[in-house]
């Protein structure tokens, strides 16, 4: 260090520290090969290994593959960062019916409220459109401001009613989003370092390619770096990001150095069999009749509930996708959970899974 620099600027002669003029303080010198987790590391724990591109460093200090959002019906919500996975969500005009870690396994188009119903809550990437009965004496088409406006950014114009939910078999169960908490927890990790004041001064999407030589001593820019299309997972392992290269998949969020790519079914298809950060099997979207009505939800795990229409009418859902192939799963996690209001019109216990029979009539799903 220069002799004319104040004594404290030399960090008291401590070789394991260096003086950062920008923050005017002594910083811990990360060992070669490790990257700092913040602009001015203070201790060894502030240094990390560098994962490959498209991998992220998870909470257990493992390089884990970021999910991909390459399926047509997915868009990237947050990029793959050094310490968090890429997060995918359903593209505008669709909502997630079956969640996957950092992604959505199954996206459906937002439903259009049928005749006699109006939009109560517009659809989002997480929730389907919520419909409610139009007030008597008011034109159904303009019963609320939402119905007299252009579709919101979360919806797309529809020339004909869009399916409100898929049917899955002759006793088809309605999909209910599962694994939301996992996705929410993963998403919450995105706030850890990339955008926090203590983070390194570069965007979270930066894979950390800056050092072209072995990490210079004192540069503090050396973290475990995974291969491209891998991310540093929570265990600190480099884990492969899922691939969305199948024709029926689109990328929802890209693979980042610290978060996985997430994939979802392309528009017009729904996920019949979920997979981590992706969908194992996509099937064409089924069609539901106009009488099926959506209701708001209290639980985050449920995208939509369906209120039974007034007595004397029955929902009429096409139970099979266009290609005749029915989704495989009829597990309770994909079943319709009837809320307390719906249970007033149907003699079914609250929270009981309900399926649509081949005739479209609600039946109790024993699970």
């Amino acid at each position: 260090f220069p002799q004319d620099r104040p004594f404290e600027d030399t960090c008291h002669g401590n070789p394991s520290h260096y003086y950062d003029k920008a923050v005017r303080r002594c910083c811990y010198r990360c060992p070669m090969g490790l990257f700092p987790t913040q602009q001015c590391p203070q201790r060894p724990t502030d240094c990390r290994k560098q994962c490959e591109p498209d991998y992220y460093l998870d909470e257990a200090d493992r390089c884990t593959a970021c999910v991909t959002c390459s399926r047509d019906d997915l868009v990237e919500k947050t990029p793959c960062a050094w310490n968090s996975s890429r997060v995918c969500e359903c593209r505008p005009g669709m909502f997630c019916s079956t969640s996957a870690v950092n992604s959505c396994a199954r996206c459906f188009f937002h439903s259009v409220c049928p005749a006699g119903m109006i939009v109560k809550f517009p659809g989002t990437a997480q929730k389907n459109t919520v419909c409610e009965p139009a007030s008597p004496g008011v034109s159904p088409a303009c019963a609320s401001p939402e119905n007299c406006k252009e579709p919101s950014s979360g919806t797309i114009p529809q020339a004909k009613p869009t399916p409100v939910s898929p049917a899955t078999s002759s006793a088809s169960t309605m999909p209910v989003r599962g694994g939301t908490r996992l996705a929410q927890e993963a998403a919450s990790k995105l706030t850890r370092a990339p955008d926090s004041p203590s983070s390194v001064g570069r965007p979270s999407s930066d894979p950390g390619l800056s050092p072209t030589q072995p990490c210079p001593e004192g540069s503090g820019d050396c973290r475990k770096q995974c291969e491209p299309d891998y991310y540093l997972d929570e265990a600190g392992r480099c884990t492969a990001c899922v691939s969305c290269s199948r024709d029926d998949l689109v990328e929802k969020t890209p693979c980042a150095w610290n978060s996985s790519r997430t994939c979802e079914c392309r528009p017009g298809m729904i996920c019949a069999t979920s997979a981590t950060n992706s969908c194992a099997r996509c099937v064409p979207y089924p069609i539901c009749a106009a009488e099926t009505v959506t209701k708001p939800q209290d639980m985050a795990e449920k995208d939509t509930t369906f209120e039974a229409p007034p007595l004397g009418t029955q929902p009429d859902c096409n139970p099979t996708p266009e290609n005749g192939e029915a989704p495989a799963s009829t597990s309770p996690t994909q079943s319709l959970l009837v809320d307390s209001q719906a249970s007033k019109t149907l003699p079914i216990p609250t929270s009981a899974p309900v399926a649509l029979s081949s005739t479209g009539k609600p039946v109790l799903d024993a699970g």
């Epitope: 390619l209 072995p214 990490c215």
Partner: antibody
Framework: EVQLVQSGAEVKKPGSSVKVSCKAS????????MNWVKQAPGQGLEWIGQ????????NYNGKFKGRVTLTADKSSSTAYMELSSLRSEDTAVYFC????????????WGQGTLVTVSS | EIVLTQSPATLSLSPGERATLSCRAS??????????MLWYQQKPGQPPKLLIY???NVESGIPARFSGSGSGTDFSLTISSLEPEDFAMYFC?????????FGGGTKVEIK
């Protein structure tokens, strides 16, 4: 000076295993990925996998996964590649190589270890 | 996996001539604004030696006559004026996807 020194040539029987070592010096062994590359006689290069000695994290080429195990001993700054169920096509020179952080290049290589599989 | 195709397989040239080696990837090697393409030189009985990283960056200590170019899927290594010690095998490598893969190699031999 960075150096990677590999163990000597090996002759093995089909079905057996071989463990090649790579002793590193001159740098922070724990903080750099150690890659392993195969080169069959007169052939090109084939990436086997890599290990991060700091925590034992690994990436493998699927072609070798199941038969190759990469390990590292931080105390001796030595990386190991063990190949099991040997067959004749495993006859090759095996290199260890340090991977640079940042651009993923392999800047320092071991001298190579010839493994001959013959009955 | 990404397939790298090098051409030509053999390049017969004289010292002082310009050598251009090609490497084509089966998919893009772009990654956050850089191409994860590497070039190595290998001589008989020796390990490969890093020449070029990130498609166009010359490794420290490598003579300036070596240069790399290209992006996406098409890359090339150029030796502006061949020296006797440049006659060797050259391999391209991609690090964009695991598994990392190498090209089949181009042998630069004396004409």
């Amino acid at each position: 000076e960075v150096q990677l020194v590999q163990s000597g040539a090996e002759v093995k029987k089909p079905g057996s295993s071989v463990k090649v070592s790579c002793k590193a010096s001159g740098y922070a062994f724990s903080s750099y990925w150690m890659n392993w590359v195969k080169q069959a006689p007169g052939q090109g290069l084939e990436w086997i996998g890599q290990i991060y000695p700091g925590d034992g994290d690994t990436n493998y080429n699927g072609k070798f996964k199941g038969r190759v195990t990469l390990t590292a001993d931080k105390s001796s700054s030595t990386a190991y590649m063990e190949l099991s169920s040997l067959r004749s096509e495993d006859t090759a020179v095996y290199f260890c190589a340090r991977r640079i952080n940042g651009n993923f290049a392999m800047d320092y290589w071991g001298q190579g270890t010839l493994v001959t599989v013959s009955s | 996996e990404i397939v790298l195709t090098q051409s030509p397989a053999t390049l017969s040239l004289s010292p002082g001539e310009r050598a251009t080696l090609s490497c084509r990837a089966s998919e893009s090697l772009e990654y956050y604004g850089t191409s994860l393409m590497l070039w190595y030189q290998q001589k008989p009985g020796q390990p490969p030696k890093l020449l070029i990283y990130s498609a166009s960056n010359v490794e420290s200590g490598i003579p300036a006559r070596f240069s790399g170019s290209g992006s996406g899927t098409d890359f090339s290594l150029t030796i502006s004026s061949l020296e006797p010690e440049d006659f060797a095998m050259y391999f391209c490598q991609q690090r964009r996807k695991v598994p990392s893969t190498f090209g089949g190699g181009t042998k630069v031999e004396i004409k």
